[in-house]
Amino acid sequence: FKVATPYSLYVCPEGQNVTLTCRLLGPVDKGHDVTFYKTWYRSSRGEVQTCSERRPIRNLTFQDLHLHHGGHQAANTSHDLAQRHGLESASDHHGNFSITMRNLTLLDSGLYCCLVVEIRHHHSEHRVHGAMELQVQTGKDAPSNCVVYPSSSQDSENITAA
């Protein structure tokens, strides 16, 4: 399978909410012993390999934000910790995987990475990630709502084996 990032850049005004999205593409094993571990984290540009560095999102680590579910299931983070930080990650039946960030501030600007790991019998079999940038703006140049910029076709199917 691959991970697609429909949008490579999100430009949002301060105070707005945004939902960053990744999408699982290709054949997904739905065997009873196969599950998917999905999470989000921040990273930085200019690395040898994008998304290799893992930084927290609003002080929450990738472990705090993870989802773990069967290939045919939907899931979301319901625990208070994420919601207290204005965050919620979710995954639907169609392979869409997202993180919603509420009440954006300038500090939220940066590179965000989604990670999907195929797990069989509690062991990782395959892992892919996708990257996108969030720019939070303030002042007269800021848009009134979030503006999203589609990835190039090459970027959107960002299959990066970690």
Partner: antibody, heavy 122, light 112 residues
Framework: QVQLVQSGAEVKKPGASVKVSCKAS????????IHWVRQAPGQGLEWMGE????????NYNEKFRNRVTMTRDTSTSTVYMELSSLRSEDTAVYYC???????????????WGQGTLVTVSS | DIVMTQSPLSLPVTPGEPASISCRST???????????LEWYLQKPGQSPQLLIY???NRFSGVPDRFSGSGSGTDFTLKISRVEAEDVGVYYC?????????FGQGTKLEIK
């Protein structure tokens, strides 16, 4: 600090069932699998299976598949292991253990409960 | 099922001396993802087991550096560079590469 506290000792008759609990505290319950390992008197360790508290997924040792059921209650951060059709050979100390994971991938059983002695005797 | 065989089963050691425990598996425990899920646990008298080494050679936090693990494929070794009195107990190797996950039969380390 991480703690796994198990229920007290049980005495059961052959053919009966036993349900042992393991209450977790000091960490995010749904982020770590819980394993069950047993140890017969004077014997070695035997892995019985594991449960993922976030989704209820289980992996059982085939030897116990038809007799063991592992469940969890996320509201109380407790995992249960029920073993049915007990026989004398099931007399053992039953341990729960948490496994440390990274990206959903198993690493090792890093914290263990104190053990629960189950005695099967007529 | 993969059988893990430890030797020796009993290991009397003088404090300050080194000790070595061997663990062999009946087939390779290298997982298809490239990892080798081989661990070592110590069960001190009257206590629950405790983790020493994971993934062949990684020391768990708080484990003294006198403990080291090595090996590959089917042959693995736990070494204690200088045995101390508190190291007494039963040492178990454990493979988690192939279901069902299995323990070795244990090696009892005692002080001479």
């Amino acid at each position: 600090q991480v703690q796994l506290v198990q229920s007290g000792a049980e005495v059961k008759k052959p053919g009966a069932s036993v349900k042992v609990s393991c209450k977790a505290s000091g960490y995010t319950f749904t982020s770590y699998w819980i394993h069950w390992v047993r140890q017969a008197p004077g014997q070695g360790l035997e892995w019985m299976g594991e449960i993922n508290p976030s989704n209820g997924l289980t992996n059982y040792n085939e030897k116990f598949r038809n007799r063991v059921t592992m469940t969890r209650d996320t509201s109380t951060s407790t995992v249960y292991m029920e073993l049915s059709s007990l026989r004398s050979e099931d007399t053992a100390v039953y341990y729960c253990a948490r496994s440390y994971d990274y990206d959903g991938d198993y690493y090792a059983m890093d914290y263990w409960g104190q053990g629960t002695l189950v005695t099967v005797s007529s | 099922d993969i059988v893990m065989t430890q030797s020796p089963l009993s290991l009397p050691v003088t404090p300050g001396e080194p000790a070595s425990i061997s663990c062999r598996s009946t087939q390779s425990i290298v997982h298809s993802n490239g990892n080798t899920y081989l661990e070592w646990y110590l069960q001190k008298p009257g206590q629950s087991p405790q983790l020493l080494i994971y993934k062949v050679s990684n020391r768990f936090s708080g484990v003294p550096d006198r403990f080291s693990g090595s090996g590959s494929g089917t042959d693995f070794t736990l070494k204690i560079s200088r045995v101390e009195a508190e190291d007494v107990g039963v040492y178990y190797c454990f493979q988690a590469s192939h279901v069902p996950w299995t323990f070795g039969q244990g090696t009892k380390l005692e002080i001479k």
